[in-house]
Amino acid sequence: GELETSDVVTVVLGQDAKLPCFYRGDSGEQVGQVAWARVDAGEGAQELALLHSKYGLHVSPAYEGRVEQPPPPRNPLDGSVLLRNAVQADEGEYECRVSTFPAGSFQARLRLRVLVPPLPSLNPGPALEEGQGLTLAASCTAEGSPAPSVTWDTEVKGTTSSRSFKHSRSAAVTSEFHLVPSRSMNGQPLTCVVSHPGLLQDQRITHILHVSFLAEASVRGLEDQNLWHIGREGAMLKCLSEGQPPPSYNWTRLDGPLPSGVRVDGDTLGFPPLTTEHSGIYVCHVSNEFSSRDSQVTVDVLDPQEDSGKQVDLVSAS
């Protein structure tokens, strides 16, 4: 006869490991007992358990409550055992010694490999601002056994760098994602992807990129100066800018307070029926947590009475 086992048994941390040991014998052969021991190189054998055909399972004190026989039905030639709740310290070499009648003793070795799945963590870098050079957007760290793979999934252009730290029974991998911040990156996901043989599927942690910026401000509404005449209703100035975070707007008049009746509604300055009092220099002040911008325009309210002569000349000239 011969012993059937596996060269390597792989189990995820916390799961039960089946250590196989099956005697494939000729008809009439019997298994008297199976002794399991841990036999790491350089260390003496440490008994796990003894499986006796007559007296059943005896577990050594060091493994009390952790070694069991597989659930029935059981084949009398099967000397496999279950090692409950595998921990990293269980990783190593194991030997089963099978005493048979009448063929004698057989032994076989296997290696138990305990996979420690990583628990990745993503640490965003400092607040990103337009105008910065190459900047850390995020770093992602995962520790496991064996060493996990850490990559990035994003549409954003950037550079990655990885480093690995080996510990006695595991390895920690850290990957950093650097980029040159641009407003075009706002809202783009940056996802750390961690792969490991102990994971059923890749683990993913997502960071949303936010790049602070504030665009130049401009004022719309004065495109046709001739519309700004006494008595005109519904005249308004609109301040245009863009920013992240969204900017707030404030209107002032450079040459005095805002005239009565002028309404400020966020980025818009609304005028009552125009009078010459509304002539002046108006300033739109745009700001967010990142920066502030100003844009000023001169409003010159026309008096049709004063311009009527010129307008008649223009008409007659045509």
Epitope: L122, P124, P126, A127, R183, S184, M185, N186, G187, Q188, P189, T191, Q203, R204, I205, T206, H207, I208, L209, H210, L240, S241, E242, G243, Q244, P245, P246, P247, G266, D267, E289
Partner: antibody
Framework: QVQLQESGPGLVKPSETLSLTCTVS????????WSWIRQPPGKGLEWIGY???????NYNPSLKSRVTISVDMSKNQFSLRLSSVTAADTAVYYC??????????????????WGRGTLVTVSS | QSVLTQPPSVSAAPGQKVTISCSGS????????VSWYQQFPGTAPKLLIY???KRPSGIPDRFSGSKSGTSATLGITGLQTGDEADYYC????????????FGGGTKLTVL
């Protein structure tokens, strides 16, 4: 006063594409993130996805394969398309404005303005 | 099954104080700001609390928010019949199914 208004068909046939538009009035669509959120009858809220005014998008992973959000700056509108709909997509669909920023330590993200919502029924 | 856990319902008498809890994990509440929304039947939700504990203009100071670890709480004092509504918490979640997540909602009944 910024206001949001959803528009689109109230009835969509199974396997077809649901299309909704959100019109932003009284303010500009620029500088903000804009989201679609839905609520099946008698149930809770579910975020569908957002679009930044520049066009960058991010979608709920459970709907990602079926969702497209687009923006039209010239019309001050953003739109939702949800393909291959089933009865499970029957819901009130809301558009909302996001305040959305990462301050270097945590996400500041909330929906400060909402549309009234529009009921979309998926039925043959 | 919502990522953020809220009690389905709470109730209290007018004038009393009530709290609504919202429980999450390190990938959502633990590392991000929480906001709260109020929704009356047949209407759109309204922002009630943002950045854990800030109130938008127009929201009375009877409403408050707090956050500790991976949980957030909405508090309402001096309960009024007009407060009867559904309340939702929400935040960003960075885990496998990354995205904005809402709690399942809590129905507040004013007895």
């Amino acid at each position: 006063q910024v206001q949001l208004q959803e528009s689109g068909p109230g009835l969509v046939k199974p396997s077809e594409t649901l299309s909704l538009t959100c019109t932003v009035s009284g303010g500009s669509i620029s500088s903000y993130f804009w989201s679609w959120i839905r609520q099946p009858p008698g149930k809770g809220l579910e975020w569908i996805g957002y679009i930044y005014y520049s066009g960058n998008t991010n979608y709920n992973p459970s709907l990602k394969s079926r969702v497209t959000i687009s923006v039209d700056m010239s019309k001050n509108q953003f739109s939702l398309r949800l393909s291959s709909v089933t009865a499970a997509d029957t819901a009130v669909y809301y558009c909302a404005r996001d305040f959305h920023h990462y301050d270097g330590s945590a996400y500041r993200w909330y929906f400060d303005l909402w549309g009234r919502g529009t009921l979309v029924t998926v039925s043959s | 099954q919502s990522v953020l856990t809220q009690p389905p319902s709470v109730s209290a008498a007018p004038g009393q104080k009530v709290t609504i809890s919202c429980s999450g994990s390190s990938s959502n509440i633990g590392n991000n700001y929480v906001s709260w929304y109020q929704q009356f039947p047949g209407t759109a939700p309204k922002l009630l609390i943002y950045d854990n504990n800030k109130r938008p203009s127009g929201i009375p100071d009877r409403f408050s928010g707090s956050k500790s670890g991976t949980s957030a709480t909405l508090g309402i004092t001096g309960l009024q019949t007009g407060d009867e509504a559904d309340y939702y918490c929400g935040t960003w979640d960075s885990s496998l199914n990354a995205g904005w997540v809402f709690g399942g909602g809590t129905k507040l009944t004013v007895l």
